[in-house]
């Protein structure tokens, strides 16, 4: 009997008004629902305009809920990133400060006349750590070549050493091992330590970036219809007290977030790789031990050069010929006392252990973020019915929800009864983010094995100018050619959200 159906729309008025919409749209009593496009077409308290407004609102509310969940995860990753980044930078800055404080006394002019070379080394290490596309081994080789040239000139001020003689010295250097074992040891340890540190921090950056970009992926029109039906059609159909059935909600959100769930496998791989690489933070080649002790390798190298000076000079003369002597020049530099070495092993401060255990726990907590998202949003944001009973809203009426819950991911939505999902059309933004996760995981795996990978970012078009090896100048044979015409700019995923902090050092 139509008259008995014609109930008051007071409750709907209240809910609709509370959402900020004009009450003039709301009928006083139920009307026939043939005009409804989304909700079942029974008697209703919703006009076409109301249905459209509520559909838009439900869409916006889901996107907000999705962004809120993402923001919490992003904030956690950003906090982790900043903590680790601060710690690693602090280790390197500490080492440089120690060098600046102790080397003048220990080495005198052998340091002060070469302060710029040491400053440059630390700057390059900082840039490398921050994700610049430069080759660490080349950078170190270049530093030792510069230093040898300058120190050799300083130790022999009485000799005439033109560029061609210095070029010859540079070519002999590898065989002569003028700095003893320090360069080799530093190269092996620093490569492993810096690669581990920077790839871990970059991993946090990539993870955060992926979450941010995925949160911006718009929900499609089919999802909007399904969410409207889930959230507000009960109001329109006069059962505003009926809460959505849990399985019904899950099916809607699994359909809506099908593409997001496809991130799961690569997301887990990334987090696993990040947890794994923290193993490389300990021991004699560990991050804390190496990054904080760069200066001790440098001191060892200068001491070795001074100790080997006579043998080295004899070998250089043997390989490069007798240099001319400056008749007005001073005698050879007096042998300085050995620079006092701080112990090479830094006692662990405990800070890194604390950071790592916190990070591991938090990364484990968010491993299933993408596949648990539908369940999380349903239980936290959708005011679900507490049980799958006959009293919950099943999308048509108050009653039991019978369809089974779909699996996770796009392919499993083929028969989703609530959201029409075209499984042949994956979202391209999400596919790109899956690729970013894969790339970063590969970097971390390479880093775990101590290998520096080409950190050219996948999203980079690879363009850029530079003069490549281009050492066309006849005086630069000494230079270690920089294989990449690297622009030394930190990459997209170097450290998202952190400023580059290229210190302007002034005299």
């Amino acid at each position: 009997d139509p008259a008995s159906k014609s109930r008051s729309c007071g409750e709907v008025r209240q809910i609709y008004g509370a959402k900020g919409f004009s009450l003039s749209d709301v009928p006083q009593a139920e009307i026939s629902g043939e005009h409804l496009r989304i909700c079942p077409q029974g008697y209703t308290c919703c006009t076409s305009e109301m249905e459209e407004n509520l559909a838009n609102r439900s869409h916006a509310e889901l996107e907000t809920a999705l962004r809120d969940s993402s923001r919490v995860l992003q904030a956690m990753l950003a906090t982790q990133l900043r903590s680790f980044d601060d710690h690693f930078q602090h280790l390197l800055n500490d080492s440089e400060r120690t060098l600046q404080a102790t080397f003048p006394g220990a080495f005198g002019e052998l340091y002060t006349q070469n302060a710029r070379a040491f400053r440059d080394l630390y700057s390059e290490l900082r840039l490398y750590y921050r994700g610049a596309n430069l080759h660490l081994e080349e950078t170190l080789a270049e530093f030792w070549a510069r230093l040898l040239e300058r120190l050799f000139k300083q130790l022999h001020p009485q000799l005439l050493l033109p560029d061609d003689y210095l070029d010859c010295l540079g070519k002999q250097a590898e065989a002569l091992r003028p700095f003893g074992e320090a360069p080799r040891e530093l190269r092996l340890r620093a490569t492993r330590a810096f690669v581990a540190a920077r790839s871990f921090v970059q991993g946090l950056g990539v993870a955060s970036d992926v979450v941010r970009k995925v949160a911006q992926v718009p929900l499609g029109p089919e999802c909007s219809r399904a969410v409207m039906k889930l959230v507000y059609c009960a109001h329109c159909l006069g059962v505003p007290g009926a809460r959505p059935c849990p399985d019904y909600c899950r099916n809607v959100l699994k359909g809506c977030l099908a593409n997001q769930a496809d991130l799961d496998a690569e997301w887990r791989n990334l987090l696993d790789s990040m947890v794994l690489i923290t193993d490389k933070f300990w021991g004699t080649s560990g991050v804390e031990s190496v990054i904080g002790s760069v200066h001790t390798w440098l001191a060892e190298a200068i001491n070795a050069l001074q100790d080997n000076r006579d043998t080295l000079t004899a070998k250089v003369i043997q390989g490069c010929g007798n240099p001319k002597v400056n008749p007005q020049g001073p005698g050879p530099e007096e042998k300085r006392r050995r620079g006092k070495l701080a112990p090479r092993e830094r006692p662990p401060s405990g800070t890194l252990e604390k950071l790592v255990s916190e990070a591991k726990a938090q990364l484990r907590d968010v491993q299933d973020f993408w596949i648990s998202l539908p369940g999380t949003l349903c239980s936290e944001k959708m005011a679900l019915s507490t049980a799958s009973d006959d009293r919950c809203w099943n999308g048509m009426a108050r009653g039991r929800y019978l369809p089974e819950v779909m699996g996770d991911g796009l392919a499993n939505q083929i028969n989703n009864p609530e959201v029409e999902v075209d499984i042949t059309k994956p979202d391209m933004t999400i596919r790109q983010q899956i690729m970013q996760l894969k790339i970063m995981t590969n970097r971390l795996r390479s880093a775990y094995n101590g290998n520096d990978v080409d950190f050219q970012d996948a999203s980079d078009d690879g363009s850029g100018s530079g003069s490549g090896d281009g050492c066309l100048d006849d005086l630069c044979s000494r230079k270690v050619s920089r294989k990449s015409s690297s622009s030394r700019t930190p990459l997209t995923h170097a450290l998202p959200g952190l400023s580059e902090q290229e210190g302007q050092k002034t005299s």
Partner: antibody
Framework: QVQLVQSGAEVKKPGASVKVSCKAS????????MHWVRQAPGQGLEWMGE????????TYNQKFKARVTMTRDTSTSTVYMELSSLRSEDTAVYYC????????????WGQGTLVTVSS | AIRMTQSPSSLSASVGDRVTITCRAS??????LHWYQQKAGKAPKLLIY???NLQSGVPSRFSGSGSGTDFTLTISSLQPEDFATYYC?????????FGQGTKVEIK
């Protein structure tokens, strides 16, 4: 061969700023320090500062420290020198010069940029 | 800052003459001393680096000597193209500094 090509002459009013560019070619840009040296009309040479194109680190002559900024753009192999709060005494030819090797020796020079400061 | 003093400020000489220019540093700079030649309206050109090394492409009539605080640039036989201003420069410490220049004119 190594070439340093500077931007054209500038006329500025006192108090203004000037930004001179120096585009490098013929070598690995990030491999050598670049310096700026100026020469007032009929005067000698005066070193203003240096920049490491690889890291962006700079060292300035104390005399100019408050007014000079040196930057680089590695994608175009260009260094820049900006001098602010110009006064008439800043009228000079400004040269960029590349080190020979890591030694503070200026083996390659730009053609110079005349900056005239006049009201 | 290290002060560099050149002498003489100017000199007149004839083609074929032997010319000597001196440069004194206000403190010892080892051999971190370099010589440049500059012609009117042109950029300076490196002649000698590290006190005594001849830059590639520079004629062998130019030579340098000295160490510590006193340095000399010698042109063994002055040529017409050598009439120019000559500057010394130290790279021992920043700020790098130049001498005030020595102008070599035709007698």
């Amino acid at each position: 061969q190594v070439q340093l090509v500077q931007s054209g002459a500038e006329v500025k009013k006192p108090g203004a700023s000037v930004k001179v560019s120096c585009k490098a070619s013929g070598y690995t840009f990030t491999g050598y320090y670049m310096h700026w040296v100026r020469q007032a009309p009929g005067q000698g040479l005066e070193w203003m500062g240096e920049i490491n194109p690889s890291t962006g680190d700079t060292t300035y002559n104390q005399k100019f420290k408050a007014r000079v900024t040196m930057t680089r753009d590695t994608s175009t192999s260009t260094v820049y020198m900006e001098l602010s709060s110009l006064r008439s005494e800043d009228t000079a030819v400004y040269y960029c010069a590349r080190e020979k090797r890591d030694d503070g020796v200026f083996a390659y020079w730009g053609q110079g940029t005349l900056v005239t400061v006049s009201s | 800052a290290i002060r560099m003093t050149q002498s003489p400020s100017s000199l007149s000489a004839s083609v074929g003459d032997r010319v000597t220019i001196t440069c004194r540093a206000s403190r010892s700079i080892s051999t971190y001393l370099h010589w440049y030649q500059q012609k009117a309206g042109k950029a300076p050109k490196l002649l000698i680096y590290s006190a005594y090394n001849l830059q590639s492409g520079v004629p062998s009539r130019f030579s340098g000597s000295g160490s510590g605080t006193d340095f000399t640039l010698t042109i063994s036989s002055l040529q017409p193209e050598d009439f120019a201003t000559y500057y010394c420069q130290q790279s021992y410490s920043t700020p790098y500094t130049f001498g005030q220049g020595t102008k070599v004119e035709i007698k």
